[in-house]
C-alpha cells in the first residue's frame, strides 16, 4: 500500500493550475463503479493536489482511485501521464510499513471516517502532535514513519506528514488516531463533530 | 494490577538456543508493546528491542540483531524472546517490559541466564 | 547513538536529605527521558517519565527535571526504601539507552 498513493500525488502535482482545475471538474462528471460515491463538489474545487490525492484514496481506495485517475487523465487528453501513473501503480501493490499489518479497509463501515472528514481541520488545528506520535507508534507508525513525523518544523507540517501515510490505515488505525486525539485535544474534536 | 511474571533460571550450553516468556496480566495485552533489557553481571542496563503486540511490529538494537528474536502469543497473554548462539557473555538477568506511549512502565522479575559447559 | 551519562557512579547520603542525580545525553533528547529505581534485590521500577511526570504509586519525594541534554532527579527527603541504583534512559532515537546508574547509599 502507498504506491499507488504516490503515483497519483506525482500525476496531479505534475498538473498546471488549469489543468488541476479542469481534472477536478472532470471528476465530477466521469462514471463510477457501482457502489462509489463522488466527492462533493464544494469540497473538490478548494483542494489542493495532496488534499485531492488523499480524497481520492479514502472516497476509492488507492487501486481504483489510481484508476479512476488515469481515465479522468486520459479523459483530458494527457495519455503520456495516464500510462505512467497506470505502469507506477502495476510495478508492484506495495506493502504496509515495515511490520505492521494494515489489512484491507473495511467494507462495513460506510462513508468517511471522522479522520479523513476533517482533515485540513486537523492539520490546522492540532498542536499537541507528539502526544498523538506516542500513541501511535509502533501500533500503526513505524519507527521510521514517526521519526519523519517529528522532523518536520511546525505542527501543521508534521499532521500534514502523518496524514501522508493514512491511506494504508484501515479503519481501526485511524480510530487509533481518533482515541488519541480525544485524550489530548477533546475539545477540538467536539468542535468538530458538531460541524 | 498490572504484572509481568518471566520464566525461571536457565543454565545452558555454548552454542546452544534458549526460549524465555514473559506472562502478563491485568492489562490489555494487545494494546502495548513488550520490551527487552539485559543487565549483565555488576553492569548497568542496556536495550534489546520490542515487539509491539497488535500488530506484532518489531525494532531491535543493531547490537542484538541475529541474536535476538522477539514474538508473542495472544491466546496465553505472553511474550516471548529467543536467544541463539549462546556464548559465555550472554549470561546475565534479562527484563521483560510493558511499553506505554513509548516509555518503560512495568518490568518483569528478570529471568537469570547461565551459559557455561 | 545516544549516549546517556551518569557522571556520578555512587552516592551517599543521609536520612532526611535532599539528593540530587544529573544524567546528561550525548544530543538533545526533547524530553524523552525516565528515571528508573533498581533494588538490591533487583526489581526495577519506573519513578518518572517524560522528564518530570510522576508514575502511579511513586511517592511525591521523588521529581525530576531538565530539558535538552541535561536532566536530574531529585529525592526530597531521603528514606530508608530509598537505597537503590537509578539508572535514566532516553527514548528520544533508537536504540534506546541508558545511563551507566547511580548507586545511593546511607551515610
Known amino acids: 500500500m502507498g504506491r499507488a498513493r504516490d503515483a497519483i500525488l506525482d500525476a496531479l502535482e505534475n498538473l498546471t493550475a488549469e489543468e488541476l482545475k479542469k481534472f477536478k471538474l472532470k471528476l465530477l462528471s466521469v462514471p463510477l463503479r457501482e457502489g462509489y460515491g463522488r466527492i462533493p463538489r464544494g469540497a473538490l474545487l478548494s483542494m489542493d493536489a495532496l488534499d485531492l490525492t488523499d480524497k481520492l484514496v479514502s472516497f476509492y481506495l488507492e487501486t481504483y482511485g489510481a484508476e479512476l485517475t488515469a481515465n479522468v487523465l486520459r479523459d483530458m487528453g494527457l495519455q503520456e501521464m495516464a500510462g505512467q501513473l497506470q505502469a507506477a501503480t502495476h510495478q508492484g501493490s506495495g506493502a504496509a510499513p515495515a511490520g505492521i499489518q494494515a489489512p484491507p479497509q473495511s467494507a462495513a463501515k460506510p462513508g468517511l471516517h471522522f479522520i479523513d472528514q476533517h482533515r485540513a481541520a486537523l492539520i490546522a488545528r492540532v498542536t499537541n502532535v507528539e502526544w498523538l506520535l506516542d500513541a501511535l507508534y509502533g501500533k500503526v507508525l513505524t519507527d521510521e514513519q514517526y521519526q519523519a513525523v517529528r522532523a518536520e518544523p511546525t505542527n501543521p507540517s508534521k499532521m500534514r506528514k502523518l496524514f501522508s501515510f493514512t491511506p494504508a490505515w484501515n479503519w481501526t488505525c485511524k480510530d487509533l488516531l481518533l482515541q488519541a486525539l480525544r485524550e489530548s485535544q477533546s475539545y477540538l474534536v467536539e468542535d468538530l463533530e458538531r460541524s | 494490577e498490572v504484572q509481568l511474571q518471566q520464566s525461571g533460571a536457565e543454565l545452558v550450553r555454548p552454542g546452544s538456543s534458549v526460549k524465555m516468556s514473559c506472562k502478563t496480566s491485568?492489562?490489555?495485552?494487545?494494546?502495548?508493546?513488550i520490551s527487552w533489557v539485559i543487565q549483565r553481571p555488576e553492569q548497568g542496563l542496556e536495550w534489546i528491542g520490542y515487539?509491539?503486540?497488535?500488530?506484532?511490529?518489531?525494532e531491535y538494537n543493531e547490537k542484538f540483531k541475529g541474536k535476538a528474536t522477539l514474538t508473542s502469543d495472544t491466546s496465553s497473554n505472553t511474550a516471548y524472546m529467543q536467544l541463539s548462539n549462546l556464548a559465555s557473555e550472554d549470561s546475565a538477568i534479562y527484563f521483560c517490559?510493558?511499553?506505554?506511549?513509548?516509555?518503560?512502565?512495568?518490568w518483569g522479575q528478570g529471568t537469570t541466564l547461565t551459559v557455561s559447559s | 547513538d545516544i549516549q546517556m551519562t551518569q557522571t556520578t557512579s555512587s552516592l551517599s547520603a543521609s536520612l532526611g536529605d535532599r539528593v540530587t542525580i544529573s544524567c546528561s545525553a550525548s544530543q538533545g533528547i526533547s524530553n524523552y527521558l525516565n528515571w528508573f529505581q533498581q533494588k538490591p534485590n533487583g526489581t526495577v521500577r519506573l519513578l518518572i517519565y517524560?522528564?518530570?511526570s510522576l508514575h502511579s504509586g511513586v511517592p511525591s519525594r521523588f521529581s525530576g527535571s531538565g530539558s535538552g541534554t541535561d536532566y536530574s532527579l531529585t529525592i526530597s527527603n531521603l528514606e530508608p526504601e530509598d537505597i537503590a541504583t537509578y539508572y535514566c534512559q532516553q527514548y528520544d532515537r533508537l536504540p534506546w539507552t541508558f545511563g551507566g546508574g547511580t548507586k545511593l547509599e546511607i551515610k
Open positions: 517490559v510493558r511499553i506505554h506511549r513509548r516509555f518503560f512502565d512495568y
Open positions: 517524560y522528564t518530570s
Open positions: 491485568g492489562f490489555t495485552f494487545t494494546s502495548y508493546g
Open positions: 515487539i509491539y503486540i497488535r500488530n506484532g511490529y518489531t
